[in-house]
Interface confidence: medium
């Protein structure tokens, strides 16, 4: 089976405050089985932004229908961006288990927030 790749094609995305940010992420294989999660930042201080299995995440919507079994697009849209949302976002595949374990991470997309146009 093909080795899983997590593709985050945008190195950075710049969005005006108040707008929505789309963060792209696709995977190249359905294996191993397990959820996708999005985090802002890396390491112990990282913040969970979206979890395919949990919720709700009021400001986050998925671009594709992630509940479909064959879905490989895990891009998300974050609404009403504020300066506090700035940071690097990682799309991470987890392997199913008790608990789920981190399997592979995308390269990250840096979100910068511009001042709201007057």
């Amino acid at each position: 089976e093909e080795e899983l790749q997590i593709i985050q094609p945008d190195k950075s995305v710049s969005v005006a405050a108040g707008e929505s940010a789309i963060l792209h992420c696709t995977i190249t294989s359905l294996f191993p089985v397990g959820p996708i999660q999005w985090f802002r930042g890396a390491g112990p201080a990282r913040v969970l932004i979206y979890n395919q299995r949990q919720g709700p995440f009021p400001r986050v919507t998925t671009v594709s229908e992630t509940t479909k079994r064959e879905n490989m697009d895990f891009s998300i849209s974050i609404s009403n961006i504020t300066p506090a949302d700035a940071g690097t976002y990682y799309c991470i595949k987890f392997r199913k288990g008790s608990p789920d374990t981190e399997f592979k991470s995308g390269a990250g997309t840096e979100l910068s927030v511009r001042a709201k146009p007057s």
């Epitope: 790749q5 593709i7 094609p9 945008d10 190195k11 950075s12 792209h24 190249t28 390269a107």
Partner: antibody, heavy 119, light 108 residues
């Protein structure tokens, strides 16, 4: 103006080594990911290797993995490609290419340096 | 790995004519596609990125279109400097970054 100047090409025998350099100027070198792209005689462009601005992230094409090593010295604004165990099929013009800061396309290229591997 | 197929391999046209170059991706690359021009003895030059955005300093006779798997580079009226080899490159699926095989635009 951005300038990328490759050097170090030449004629070598199969199995030998060569080190290419790319001297960069006109931009903040350490802020940009850099790549090597090659073009064999009469052929198209082939991506060879990528190194992130900090040097922490590195990728290689399968055709050179285990034989070529990309590196950079940000204090000297220089990109390198160490090529070992050279083969005839490595004969090409090697270009140094600067990535755009948002996406992985190449907005600046050097003129290239020719590497010929022949017995 | 995403394979890019360019067609035709060679395009023979006269100055002033319109050139249409095609690039097909083996899987969707959305709009993450760039076009380059390569003249003999010169460094490749970025023409188009994001499938349709002209790079700085590129004349408006060059235009790009398409998304997903089908892309087109159009040169509305060929000038002498435009006779060269053109490559498409995808930067969605990486690594490896992949290029098409090239289309040579030659004088008829």
């Amino acid at each position: 103006d951005v300038q990328l100047v490759e050097s170090g090409g030449g004629v070598v025998r199969p199995g030998e080594s060569l080190r290419l350099s790319c001297a960069a100027s006109g931009f903040t070198f350490s802020s940009y990911d850099m790549n090597w792209v090659r073009q064999a005689p009469g052929e198209g462009l082939e991506w060879v290797s990528l190194i992130s601005g900090s040097g922490e992230i590195i990728y290689y094409a399968d055709s050179v993995k285990g034989r070529f090593t990309i590196s950079r010295d940000n204090s000297k604004n220089t990109l390198y490609l160490q090529m070992n165990s050279l083969r005839a099929e490595d004969t090409a013009v090697y270009y140094c290419a600067k990535e755009n800061n948002r996406y992985r396309f190449f907005d600046d290229w050097g003129l290239g340096t020719l590497v010929t591997v022949s017995s | 790995e995403t394979v890019l197929t360019q067609s035709p391999g060679t395009l023979s046209l006269s100055p002033g004519e319109r050139a249409t170059l095609n690039c097909r991706a083996s899987q969707s690359v959305y709009s993450y596609l760039a076009w380059y021009q390569e003249r003999p003895g010169q460094a490749p030059r970025l023409l188009i990125y994001g499938a349709s955005t002209r790079a700085t300093g590129i004349p408006d006779r060059f235009s790009g279109s398409g998304s997903g798997t089908e892309f087109t580079l159009t040169i509305s009226s060929l000038e002498s400097d435009d006779f060269a080899v053109y490559y498409c490159q995808q930067y969605y699926d990486r690594p490896p970054l992949t290029f098409g095989g090239g289309t040579k635009v030659e004088i008829k």
